[in-house]
C-alpha cells in the first residue's frame, strides 16, 4: 500500500548470473562421405556467452558451416542471387545479403545453377533451417543463479536477494520457494506461459523481472524481491520479419598451414534481468 508519509527513492541495482547444466547433443556428422552419429557434450563454456548489462544468453540450437577458408567461390544461390551472365555481377560490390565481395564473374555453383563469384569465407554459408527439435533442447533443465545486490543511497540501505539462510540446492517455485534465487530455465518459461521446446528452435528473449517494494521503516521493515517472468520478443515467428534470436560466431584453427574457421549460427534465449522498485522510509 502507498505510504504517503514516506520518502521514496528508486532502487540502484547490480546483477550477476551463473548458469549451470550439461547437455548431450546427438547429430549426424558426415566425414569423408561417411555419415555417422556424433555425440557432443556441451558445458557452460560451450553454450553461454558473456553479455553486457543485465543479460545472459543460453544457446539452444545451432547451424554449423565447417572448414571455411578465405578464397574465391560461387556464392550460395539464395533467392535472387542467381545469374546468367557477368552483367549481373558487379566487381567490388558487396550485396548486404551476400557473404562476400563480388569479383564481377558469373560462375557455376553446381550443374544447374550459376551465381556471382565472391571473395569470401568459402564455401559460403548455406541458408539452412534451424534444426527441429532444437539440438540443445535439454537446456530446459539448466539452472541459473541470480545474484542481485541493491542499494538505496538516500536511505543508506543495501541488501541482496540471497540470504545467508538460503539453501544452495533450492529451486525457485512461485508458491513453495518464492525467495530461492536459483531458477530452472524450463520453469521460467512455464511461469511466462511459454513453451521452451518451441522457443528453443529459433531462439527468443525472456525477461526476468525483479521487483523490490521496500518498506525501510524499522517498525514494519520489509525488503524482499518478487520475481516474475515474461517473453520480450515477438512470439509470432511466422509474422515477424526476422524470427527468434540468433547471432553468428566463429572458431578459428589452422589445418595444413591454412587458416580455417567453423562458422556457427547460434540460436538461443537471451535472458534480460529487469530490476525495478522503490525504497520508502519515514
Amino acid at each position: 500500500s502507498d505510504k504517503l508519509y514516506q520518502r521514496k527513492e528508486p532502487v540502484i541495482s547490480s546483477v550477476h548470473t551463473k548458469v549451470k547444466g550439461i547437455a548431450e547433443v546427438t547429430e549426424n556428422v558426415t566425414e569423408g562421405g561417411v555419415t555417422k552419429l556424433g555425440h557432443s557434450i556441451f558445458d557452460t563454456a560451450d553454450y553461454t556467452f558473456p553479455l553486457q548489462g543485465n543479460s545472459f544468453f543460453v544457446m539452444t540450437n545451432y547451424v554449423k558451416s565447417e572448414g571455411q577458408v578465405q578464397t574465391l567461390c560461387p556464392e550460395y544461390p539464395r533467392r535472387g542471387a542467381q545469374c546468367s551472365s557477368d552483367r549481373r555481377c558487379k566487381k567490388g560490390w558487396m550485396d548486404p545479403q551476400s557473404k562476400g565481395i563480388q569479383t564481377g564473374r558469373c560462375v557455376p555453383y553446381d550443374k544447374t545453377r550459376k551465381t556471382c563469384e565472391v571473395s569470401a569465407w568459402c564455401p559460403t554459408e548455406e541458408e539452412k533451417e534451424a534444426p527441429r527439435p532444437a539440438l540443445l533442447r535439454s537446456a530446459e533443465n539448466f539452472t541459473v543463479l541470480i545474484k542481485n545486490n541493491i542499494h538505496f543511497p538516500g536511505h543508506n540501505y543495501t541488501t541482496r536477494n540471497i540470504l545467508p539462510t538460503m539453501n544452495g540446492s533450492c529451486t525457485f517455485h512461485k508458491t513453495w520457494d518464492p525467495q530461492c534465487s536459483i531458477f530452472r530455465l524450463g520453469d521460467i518459461f512455464q511461469e511466462a506461459g511459454e513453451n521452451f521446446t518451441e522457443v528453443a528452435v529459433q531462439g527468443g528473449i525472456m525477461g526476468i523481472e525483479i521487483y523490490w517494494d521496500c518498506n525501510l521503516d524499522s517498525w514494519s521493515h520489509h525488503c524482499r524481491p518478487r520475481y516474475s517472468f515474461r517473453r520480450l520478443d515477438d512470439k509470432n515467428t511466422d509474422e515477424s520479419f526476422v524470427p527468434g534470436y540468433n547471432f553468428r560466431y566463429a572458431k578459428y584453427y589452422k589445418e595444413n598451414n591454412v587458416e580455417k574457421r567453423t562458422l556457427i549460427k547460434a540460436f538461443g534465449i537471451r535472458f534480460d534481468i529487469l530490476v525495478f522498485g522503490t525504497g520508502g522510509k519515514f
Partner: nanobody
Framework: KVQLVESGGGLVQAGGSLRLSCAAS????????MGWYRQAPGKPRELVAR???????WYEDSVKGRFTISRDNAQNTVYLQMNSLKSEDTAVYYC????????WGQGTQVTVSS
C-alpha cells in the same frame, strides 16, 4: 607459404594439344580456388579458367569447349588440358591460388604456330 610451379608449356602447332601442370607445395590445394591466367605480349593478364573447392569450374568464353581445368588433390596439382589450340592462345600461362592472399607461379610459355 604456398609455392606454385608450372610445367608443360612449349611450342605446338595450331590445332594441337598441351597439358599444363601446376604443382603446389606449402598447403593443400583442396582448400581453395585454383586458376590459370595468361598474358600475351602487350596485353593485361586475363583469367582463363578457375576450379573451385566444390569441383565446379569457370572458363573464359574464348576457351570454352577447348580447355579443361582439373585438380588432383592427392598430388596437390592443378592441370589445364588445352585442345584445338589457336595462335591467339600464345601467351605466358600462370598458375594462381587464392587462400587469403594471391599466390602465383613463375609462368610457363605456350607458343602456338600457324
Amino acid at each position: 607459404k604456398v609455392q606454385l610451379v608450372e610445367s608443360g608449356g612449349g611450342l605446338v602447332q595450331a590445332g594441337g594439344s598441351l597439358r599444363l601442370s601446376c604443382a603446389a607445395s606449402g598447403s593443400p590445394i583442396s582448400s581453395y580456388a585454383m586458376g590459370w591466367y595468361r598474358q600475351a605480349p602487350g596485353k593485361p593478364r586475363e583469367l582463363v579458367a578457375r576450379i573451385y573447392t566444390g569441383g565446379t569450374a569457370w572458363y573464359e568464353d574464348s576457351v570454352k569447349g577447348r580447355f579443361t581445368i582439373s585438380r588432383d588433390n592427392a598430388q596437390n596439382t592443378v592441370y589445364l588440358q588445352m585442345n584445338s589450340l589457336k595462335s591467339e592462345d600464345t601467351a605466358v600461362y600462370y598458375c594462381h591460388g587464392r587462400v587469403r592472399y594471391d599466390y602465383w607461379g613463375q609462368g610457363t610459355q605456350v607458343t602456338v604456330s600457324s
